[in-house]
Every structure is written in C-alpha cells, then in structure tokens.
C-alpha cells in the first residue's frame, strides 16, 4: 500500500522535511503532491510525467519544493503555514488511480526563556512569590527545576497559566534555592538562567553555645549566640537584665563566683523587623586542688611485690577515679580498689603493669586529672638468648656472638667458653677462630636489682666439614587434604647451600611445595598419600657436602569408597556366600558389616555357609580409619535363588 | 491544431470483426495515451479501452473485455481497435480520444469525430 | 464496478439561470472526475477535470466542486450556446460516464 512518511515528523521553521513515498508503483503514468487531505487541482504543489519526464508547478508551488523521481517531496525552508497534510496522487500507467496523505507539524525554534518574578524578597511563612517563564510561547510546553531537580510535590507549590507561572505559596527559607524554567516543544528546548529566591525569615530562637552553664573561678567565660536568619542577625547580650554588648560573642576572662547569673542574647533581623531571645543559667563554682599521686612502693620487683597508689588530698564527700594506660580501670583480680575508691592497689606486679597511672577528684563542675605516674618494675633477667644461630663455622672466620636478656635493669653480661669466665661484654669476638675455637659458649645475664641471674648454652663447632644433616619436621602423621608438613634441615650452619631431593630426585615443580628461611625449609601444602616419599635435605659449602638420612613421610588418609569382591550380586541356594571389603586408607581401616541395616561382624572377610533366599538383602560393608577421624561404606545387594531355578547364577565358593 | 480522424466502420454481421483506425496528428503521438469512447444511438457515452503511449499497459471495459483489442503504430501515428465476434449492442458511434500528458487524474481533452459501427443481420 | 447517477437526467431554464447538475458515486473516488458537454452529433467536450480544475479555453462561468461521492457542476449564467448534454466520468477504474443530463430551453 502506498505510504507517505514525513522525515521529520516535527519540523523547526527554516529547516526542510521530506515527504518520504513508500511502496510506490513501478509502473508509472505520473504523480502529483497536494496540500491538503485531497487532490484539487487549485492546490496542487506539483505534478510530474514520466513520459515526457516534465515536473509541473501547480498553484500551491512556493519555489521551495523539489519533487523526486520516486516521487518523493521535499520541502526547504519550512514556514509556520506549512504545517498540514499532504496528498500523493499515483496514476498508474493503467490510468488506475491511487493516493496516499501525510503530514507535518511546523513548530518555531524557541528563544532563551528568562524568569520574572512578583517578589524579590518575600518574608517567610507571610509572602507568596509567583515566577513567570518569558516570553508566552504559542504551542510551547512549560517546565520548572528546582536545584535542577524536577519540581517536588507540595501543597505549596502551584503551577498555572499552562505551568507557566509557579507560585509558591507561604514561602519558608528551604524555598531558597535555584529556579530555573524551561520552554519545550517538538523541535527545540531552551532552558533559562537560574534564580535564586531570596526568603527573608528569622530570626528563629537563639542557641547559646558551649552547653556547659557551670564554671570554675579562674576560668574564661566565652558565650557565643547565634540565630538562624536571612539578613543575619544583630546580636545583643544583657547579663542579669542589664545591656552589656551589641556582638555576637561575650567574653569575661579569670571569672569570679560574682560573675554567676542570667545571661540573655536577642538576636534581631533588621528585614523582618522580629526579634528573639534564649536566656541560660551560668554557675560559677571556687575551684577545688588539683590531685597527685603517691606510692608505697617507687621500684616494686616483678611477681614479688604489690604497690598502692594514693590519691591525695583526703577530700570529704568526692568522688575519685583511675585511669591506666588513659583508660578506665580494666576488671582483674590483681586490681584492688579501698571503698572510698582512693587507693588501688596492685597485687603481684608484672612489667606490663608499668603504666601510666591517673587519679582523679569529681566535682560539680568537672573531672580534675593527677598527673601522670609510671611505674618502675623491676624483672628479669629472662633466659638469654645468643645470635646469630649459626653452630657451625668454618676455620678463619669472625665468630661475632650478641646476648640478650629482657631485663630492668638492663642485665649485666659475661660469656663462658667451656666453662671459663672471658669477658663482661653483651658481645663476644674471636677473630680468625681455627677447630681449637670449638667448644661450650655460655652468656650468663645478671640483674644487679632483683639479684637474679640466668644463662644459655650454646656449642660451637669450627670444622673445615661439614657436619652430616638431619631433618626434622613439624607433623609426623599429617592427613591428606588436610595438613601442611614443615621439614627442616639441621643444623643451621654459616655461608652454607642447602639442598633437597625427593626419591633420590632433585625436587619437581609444585605449587604445593614452597622453599625458605634460605632453601633450609621445605613445606609441603595440602599433602597427598603421593607425598609418602623419601625425603633428603643436603648442606654443602666450598670446601664439602653431606648428606642427611632420608625421612619418609608418613601420610595418613583414606578410607577410600570400599570394593566388595566377588562382584556377582546373584547366588544359587546352598552355596557359600564369601565376600572380602576393600578400601585404600593408611592406617589400615577397620572393617564391619551390616546386612539389611543390622550389625554383624567386625572382619574384612563376611562368611556365610550354605545361604538360602533369607539371605537375599543389601550387604553394607563400613570402613572408618581413627586417625584421620574418617569413614567411608559401600552397599552390595544379594539374591538368592532356588537352585536349578535361574541359570548363570554363580554356584558360590 | 489537434486533429484525430477515425476511419474502418461501417455494417457487419453478429459474429463479425471490425478493425477501427485513428489518424492523429498536431501533437506527440508517441508519448501519448489514447483511448475508445462509444455511443449507442440516443445513449450515453461509454468508454471502451485506453493504451499506454509504449504499447504494454491496456485497459478495457468489462462489456468487450476478451473480444476486442487495442493497439497503437507509433511510427505511422495510428491507433486501432480490432474487434472480433461483434453483438448487436456493439451498435454505436466509436470516438477516438487523447489523454493529456498531466499529472492528473486521467481525462480525455481530444476527440475525434467519431465513426458508425453498425452490426446487424 | 462503479456506478455514476446523474440528477436530473433533464432540466429546463432560461438564458441567464443559475444551473447545478449533480453526480452521485457508488463509492468514494477522491477527486478523480470530469465534466464533458455533448452537442447533438458533436463529439463530447471537456470541461471540468479533478473535480474543480477547468479546462483550458472553456468559460469561467463553469466550476465544478466536491469530493468523495457526491459532485456538482455549476454554470453560473446560461449563455445560449450551454444547452447541450452533461456527462460526469470517474476517472477511476475503469472510466465509466454517468448518464447524462440534458439542458433544455424553458
């Protein structure tokens, strides 16, 4: 069916559209555009012939239409008048007519609208503002934002003359914002420049700040008021009635108990012609002592003594707290506080006890703090330890050895090689040390305080070889899928290259396997039963190379899904009912059966004699493995027949 | 001056055939449609046929539709209708006719004179 | 096929009378119709075409109107040389005349 298709449908005066033909005939007379919804002659656009391939301009032609040879029209330069339908009469080249309408709305392009307003200061909650979108705009949509959002639903807001005006009624300060209007209409949108609504309201009751309408002697009292207004306010402030200042914040240093009283700020607004008022209380209070503390004990020993802690003076009717560490007492039965709660006592001290410590006096006012106090506890020394941990060192090497013990004091130290006092040094050095340097390496750690002393061991051997290595591991009975296994390689040993083999192989690339602390660690992730190998770590220097024993490692797993065998589920009448069960697991699994759910015996092998068709039912065999804390079964299901009744059945064992 | 001359009638028998001729001239003969428009004696116009200027696209009047056909010699400037298995209500004055070159709904502006087809026994 | 009726299929008036012949459709043909004049033993002239649009050297006192189904063709003063028959034609498929209204002297 012939169509007519206005591209565009809309159209922007002084832009074109072309009346678009679909499904034109192929053969061809000719063809003539109307305007209108009809053919009349008196308002034919144009005609076109194809035998004599003549357009023909009619008395609607205005010079701004091009026909096309597929009868297609497009109009150029497009006026308001244009808007309409249009008419396309085919006649075909067997004089049979046909005609299609279509048509085009014509719209101006829209100017910049602007806003106009009744009222550029309205007063809260009194003043209605109605805003105006310029200029009025024939067939032309009137939109509004406010803060660029879409206009809110309320009671307040209410558009009319077709939306372009907006009236908000009963204005109130959140109405100050950013209006902006914009025109609409097929063709274009334009949006106007924003305005701001400038509501004059307050001022609303003042608020005082700080809160706090108690005082100490001394302090500085500084009040600051403020009012929510627009114009700001004007500030004055009256102390017991009597006018003091006209500003927004007062101030009184080194106040006196005189200084207690009313205290009152009005806040006015010039615009709105209102005025409020708050009034607060001000308390002055003569200021208390501030607190210390005192110990019975300045340098108590760790897991020896207790020490009290005082808080001074001896204040009648007050309340005293404690802080350590500037946090409120923590519960725990070495904490002991006096019922007035201004001596605690700390029972068997230890080195974390050591503080600070904070007393402090309650008042109606405030909280008065002591100063800090830390605690001097003596412990120690602890077991010292000697580094590096090397214990094997090859002859013309430094032997560099450090101590230390925690201790407070800090210990006094003095080393022992086989038992002979060398020297009261946290340090030992021996320079270019040869096998004669080998021995007993003893660091004894002294606390001159506690009179406590405690002493490490340590064998060095100088050699030119290497020692043979050992390795030990973190878990001897890891489970699979379970466990990591850490194997270690001893001892640690200077300047050294340590070596692994797995199966008298170098090791294969795993991500389950990982090396470090120097290749001396091999840990194995998530191990496998294929992990049960032996295991060779190696130490090897410029000068030799040993190797440990191997260590296999023991992987606990299973029980595997069990296997019952024979694996015939038919049986004749009279035969022998032999079955064995069959799961992979390390240890060895414990067995049991259940025929038709009922417990039977706790072997791997269920023998039954001379079976008949009450024997038929579901074998279950039950495997469970203690160290891994896993089991496992399997379920078979017998028949047996009357004998001669069913052939191919198994004749049993 | 648009001139259009038919010529071929006269009497025939029912059952005859009959060829009709138009002559024309003052215009582009070979661009343009043409027609048959006949006229029973005291009756009104009816029309028979119409030709496309190339020849292909026909048209006719359901009352002669499968007995008369209509053709064109653009070279020698004549239309034809050949009429075959004549009736008696085939009786009437044969008007040839040119539809003007406008992008129009179609409309006859030249006429011949016509010529007297008669069939009777 | 389309049907065309003419009314009235006569009429009587007087030189200088304002005549309206009218044509019926079967059904809506748009605009496609013409208006021809026959004289006795004359062969038929074209007057209106596309409803409305006159044909070139016929009298302006002619003019043809409507749409659709039903048309009109008016001569707006009788001259002497109008009395003659009217013939509608749809210029549809296929092109049949209506039949006919004769114009007589009152």
């Known amino acids: 069916k012939l169509t007519i298709e206005s591209t565009p449908f809309n159209v922007a005066e002084g832009k074109e559209v072309l009346l678009l033909v679909h499904n034109l005939p192929q053969h061809l007379f000719g063809y003539s555009w109307y305007k209108g919804e009809r053919v009349d002659g008196n308002r034919q656009i144009i005609g076109y012939v194809i035998g004599t391939q003549q357009a023909t301009p009619g008395p609607a032609y205005s010079g701004r239409e091009i026909i096309y040879p597929n009868a297609s029209l497009l109009i150029q330069n497009i006026i308001q008048n244009d808007t309409g339908f249009y008419t396309l009469h085919v006649i075909k080249s067997d004089l049979v007519n046909e005609e299609a309408t279509g048509q085009f709305r014509v719209y101006p392009e829209l100017p910049k609208p602007s806003i106009s307003s009744n009222n550029s200061k309205p007063v809260e909650d009194k003043d209605a503002v109605a805003f105006t979108c310029e200029p009025e705009t024939q067939d032309a949509t009137y939109l509004w934002w406010v803060n660029n959002q879409s206009l809110p639903v309320s009671p307040r807001l209410q558009l009319s003359n077709g939306n372009r005006t907006l009236t908000l009624f009963n204005v109130t300060r959140n109405d100050t914002a950013s209006y902006k209007c914009e025109t609409q209409n097929p063709v274009s949108a334009r949006r106007s420049d924003s305005v701001i609504l400038n509501v004059l309201y307050g001022p609303d009751a003042p608020t005082i700040s700080p809160l706090n309408t108690s005082y100490r002697s001394g302090e500085n009292l500084n009040l600051s008021c403020h009012a929510a207004s627009n114009p700001p306010a004007q500030y004055s402030w009256f102390v017991n009635g009597t006018f003091q200042q006209s500003t927004q914040e007062l101030f009184i240093p080194n106040i006196t108990v005189n200084n207690s009283g009313s205290y009152t700020c009005q806040a006015h607004n010039s615009d709105t012609g209102l005025n409020r008022t708050t009034v607060t209380t001000i308390t002055v209070y003569a200021e208390p002592p501030k607190p210390f503390i005192t110990s019975n004990n300045s340098n108590p020993v760790e897991d020896e003594d207790a020490v009290a802690l005082t808080c001074e003076p001896e204040i009648q009717n007050t309340t005293y707290l404690w802080w350590v560490n500037n946090q409120s007492l923590p519960v725990s039965p070495r904490l002991q506080l006096s019922n007035d709660n201004r001596t605690l006592t700390l029972l068997s001290v230890t080195r974390n006890d050591v503080g600070p410590y904070e007393c402090g006096i309650q008042n109606e006012l405030s909280v008065d703090h002591s100063d800090p106090v830390i605690l001097n506890v003596l412990y120690g020394p602890d077991d010292p330890t000697i580094s590096p941990s090397y214990t094997y060192y090859r002859p013309g090497v430094n032997l560099s050895l450090s101590c230390h013990a925690a201790s407070n004091p800090p210990a006094q130290y003095s080393w022992l090689i086989d038992g002979n006092i060398q020297q009261h040094t946290q340090e030992l050095f021996i320079s270019n040390i040869t096998e004669k340097n080998s021995g007993l390496y003893t660091c004894q750690a002294n606390n001159s305080a506690s009179g406590h002393s405690r002493t490490t061991v340590k064998t060095i051997t100088v050699s030119a070889e290497l020692p043979k290595p050992s390795i030990s591991s973190n878990n001897s009975k890891p489970v699979e899928d379970k466990d990591a296994v850490a194997f270690t390689c001893e001892p640690e040993a200077q300047n050294t290259t340590y070596l692994w083999w797995v199966n008298g192989q170098s090791l294969p690339v795993s991500p389950r396997l990982q090396l470090s602390n120097g290749n001396r660690t091999l840990t194995l992730f998530n191990v496998t039963r294929n992990d049960a190998r032996a295991y060779v770590c190696g130490i090897q220097n410029s000068v030799s190379a040993n190797r440990s024993d191997p260590v296999t490692l023991d992987v606990l797993y299973g029980p595997d899904t069990p296997i019952i065998s024979p694996p015939d589920s038919s049986y004749l009448s009279g035969a022998n009912l032999n079955l064995s069960c069959h799961s992979a697991s390390n240890p060895s699994p414990q067995y049991s059966w259940r025929i038709n759910g009922i417990p039977q015996q706790h072997t791997q092998v269920l023998f039954i004699a001379k079976i008949t068709p009450n024997n038929n039912g579901t074998y279950a065999c039950f495997v469970s493995n203690l160290a891994t804390g896993r089991n496992n079964s399997i379920v078979k299901s017998i028949t047996v027949s009357a004998s001669g009744t069913s052939p191919g059945l198994s004749a049993g064992a | 001056e648009v001139q259009l001359l038919e010529s071929g009638g006269g009497l025939v028998q029912p059952g005859g055939s009959l060829r009709l001729s138009c002559a024309a001239s003052g215009f582009t003969f070979s661009s343009s449609y043409m027609g048959w428009v006949r006229q029973a004696p005291g009756k009104g116009l009816e029309w028979v046929s119409s030709?496309?200027?190339?020849?292909?696209?026909?048209s006719y009047a359901d009352s002669v539709k499968g007995r008369f056909t209509i053709s064109r010699d653009n070279s020698k400037n004549t239309l034809y209708l050949q009429m075959n298995s004549l009736r008696a209500e085939d009786t009437a004055v044969y008007y040839c006719?040119?539809?003007?070159?406008?992008?129009?709904?179609?409309?006859?502006?030249?006429w011949g004179q016509g010529t007297l087809v008669t069939v009777s026994s | 096929d389309i049907q065309m009726t003419q009314s009235p299929s006569s009429l009587s008036a007087s030189v200088g009378d304002r005549v309206t012949i009218t044509c019926r459709a079967s059904q809506s043909i748009s605009s496609y119709l013409n208006w021809y004049q026959q004289k006795p033993g004359k062969a038929p002239k074209l007057l209106i075409y596309?409803?409305?649009s006159l044909q070139s050297g016929v009298p302006s006192r002619f003019s043809g109107s409507g749409s659709g189904t039903d048309f009109t063709l008016t001569i707006s003063s009788l001259q002497p040389e109008d009395f003659a028959t009217y013939y509608c034609?749809?210029?549809?498929?296929?092109?049949?005349f209506g039949q006919g209204t004769k114009l007589e002297i009152k």
């Open positions: 596309a409803a409305s």
């Open positions: 006719a040119h539809y003007p070159s406008v992008p129009f709904p179609p409309h006859l502006d030249y």
């Open positions: 034609q749809q210029a549809g498929n296929p092109h049949t």
């Open positions: 030709i496309g200027s190339g020849s292909y696209s026909t």
